[in-house]
Interface confidence: medium
C-alpha cells in the first residue's frame, strides 16, 4: 500500500493521527491553517474589494472515480477516450484570488446520514454533503501537483447540499454514473460538465486561508464558501451510500462519512462581500458598511 | 512479523470497571499510533480508542469520559482502562498497531471478550 492511500476517516489511521504516521504530513496536527472549519456568522468580516468569483461556463469531459477514500471527478485531457481533441481548460477568478487558476478537480464528502457529511459547517450545523471544486494556479505554476505545496497554490470552491426534491442538473450528471464506480479503482467518463452549473445562484461567499482537508494538508489553499447550498435528492444521496471503499471480494466499509472534522480557526479572519446595506433610503448607492456593531447571523433555512 | 495479544477480557457487572492490555512481540516504538477497536455481535467492527508515540488519544464519542487508553513503550504494552461499563460494551476487543516502514502496515490482535451483565 502506498503512503498516499494509506489513510482513512476514522480510526487509527484517522484524521487525529494523520500528522503522527507519516512525518510528511506533519501539517495535519501541527499546521495553524487548517480546513475545514465552522463558519461562525459573527466573526465575518466585510470587505468591500472582494469581487464575484468567475468560473468559465464551457463544458469539459473527465473521469469520476470512487478512491477509496472519496468520489473525484477529474478534468481530463486529450489523451483520454472519447475527447473530441484538446479541451479548453476551465478557469477560476475573480473573488479573493490574485490569480487565475486552472480547474483540476472535484471533491464529494457526504454522511451515512443527513445530519453530517459537510467539511465545512455554518454555526455549527453540517450538511448532508459538500462538493469541493480546485484549482490550481496556472500562471505560477505547471500543474496541480507542483501548485499543492505552493504558495498560493490552489483554490477550493466549498458548495454545501441541502436536501431538496429536485436536484441541481449538473450534480445529477454526476451521480448518473455512480452506479458505474460502486467499488474503490472504479471510474467512469463524464462527458460535457458544467463546472459553473454547480454553483448555486449567488454571488455572494465567505473565504479563509487554509489547507487541502487530506493528507498531507497543505496549507496553499485559498478557500471560497459559497453562501447558497444546492440541492440533493434523497435518492442521490442513497446512491452515494451505496459505494464502498474496497473492491467487489473485499468491499471493506462504505465510502461515507469521508469528511474531515473541524479544525481550530486561531487568528485567521474570515472576510465576506455579504454587505447588509447597498443602497440609501433615496435610492442612491451607499457605502459599504464597515460598522463594527453590524453582526451577521445565520439564517433559517439551514434548519430546513 | 508483529504479533499482538490481548488480555484482560472477561464478565463484569453494569458499572464494573476492567483494565485491557496488549502485548506486542516486537518493539512499539516504531507504531507511532496504537488503538483498540471492538465488534459487538452481528455489529461492525468500530474503533474505541487510539493512542500516538507521543501520548496524543483519541476516543469514540460512546467512549469519552469512560475509557482511557495509555501505553508504556518500555514494557511494548497499551492499555485500554474501562470504566462504567454498560451491557452496550459487550463486545470482542481487539488490539491494532500501526507500523511505518518503507510502506504503513496495520497489525491486529486476536481480540479478547468482554462481557458486561446488567
Known amino acids: 500500500v502506498s503512503w498516499e492511500d494509506w489513510w482513512t476517516y476514522d480510526g487509527i489511521s484517522g484524521p487525529a493521527f494523520w500528522g503522527l504516521i507519516n512525518p510528511e504530513w506533519s501539517l495535519c496536527n501541527k499546521g495553524r491553517r487548517q480546513s475545514p472549519v465552522n463558519l461562525e456568522p459573527q466573526r465575518l468580516l466585510f470587505d468591500p474589494n472582494l469581487r464575484p468569483m468567475h468560473i468559465d461556463k464551457h463544458r469539459i469531459s473527465g473521469l469520476i472515480t470512487n478512491t477509496g477514500h472519496s468520489v473525484i471527478f477529474t478534468a481530463g485531457n486529450d489523451t483520454v477516450a472519447n475527447y473530441d481533441g484538446m479541451q479548453t481548460p476551465v478557469n477560476i477568478s475573480g473573488g479573493p484570488l490574485s490569480y487565475r487558476y486552472r480547474f483540476h478537480e472535484i471533491h464529494m464528502h457526504y454522511g451515512l446520514n443527513d445530519q453530517f457529511g459537510s467539511e465545512h459547517s455554518v454555526e455549527g450545523y453540517t450538511f448532508p454533503a459538500e462538493i469541493q471544486i480546485f484549482g490550481y494556479n496556472s500562471q505560477l505554476y505547471a500543474n496541480f501537483s507542483d501548485a499543492l505545496n505552493r504558495a498560493q497554490g490552489i483554490v477550493g470552491v466549498s458548495i454545501l447540499l441541502q436536501l431538496g426534491d429536485l436536484s441541481n442538473a449538473e450534480l445529477r450528471m454526476l451521480t448518473d454514473q455512480l452506479e458505474r464506480i460502486r467499488y474503490g479503482g472504479d471510474e467512469a467518463f463524464v462527458k460535457r460538465l458544467s463546472i459553473r452549473g454547480l454553483l448555486p445562484d449567488t454571488d455572494h461567499y465567505m473565504t479563509y486561508d487554509g489547507s487541502t482537508t487530506a493528507p498531507a494538508c497543505h496549507e496553499t489553499v485559498t478557500w471560497v464558501v459559497l453562501n447558497k447550498p444546492i440541492y440533493i435528492t434523497k435518492q442521490q444521496l442513497h446512491a452515494l451510500r451505496r459505494l464502498m471503499q474496497g473492491s467487489p471480494d473485499h468491499p471493506k466499509a462504505p465510502l461515507g462519512n469521508n469528511y474531515r472534522p473541524p479544525q481550530p480557526l486561531l487568528h485567521r479572519p474570515i472576510r465576506t462581500n455579504i454587505d447588509f446595506k447597498t443602497t440609501k433610503s433615496n435610492g442612491k448607492a451607499a457605502c459599504p458598511t464597515m460598522y463594527r456593531e453590524v453582526y451577521y447571523k445565520a439564517t433559517s433555512w439551514k434548519q430546513n | 512479523q508483529v504479533q499482538l495479544q490481548e488480555s484482560g477480557g472477561g464478565l463484569v457487572q453494569a458499572g464494573g470497571s476492567l483494565r485491557l492490555s496488549c502485548a506486542a512481540s516486537g518493539t512499539i516504538s516504531y507504531a507511532p499510533v496504537m488503538g483498540w477497536y471492538r465488534q459487538a455481535p452481528g455489529k461492525e467492527r468500530e474503533f474505541v480508542a487510539g493512542?500516538?508515540?507521543?501520548?496524543?488519544?483519541n476516543y469514540a464519542d460512546s467512549v469519552k469520559g469512560r475509557f482511557t487508553i495509555s501505553r508504556d513503550n518500555a514494557k511494548n504494552t497499551v492499555y485500554l482502562q474501562m470504566n462504567s461499563l454498560k451491557p452496550e460494551d459487550t463486545a470482542v476487543y481487539y488490539c491494532?498497531?500501526?507500523?511505518?516502514?518503507?510502506?504503513?502496515?496495520?497489525?491486529w490482535g486476536q481480540g479478547t471478550q468482554v462481557t458486561v451483565s446488567s
Open positions: 493512542i500516538s508515540l507521543g501520548g496524543n488519544t
Open positions: 491494532a498497531a500501526v507500523y511505518v516502514g518503507s510502506s504503513p502496515y496495520e497489525y
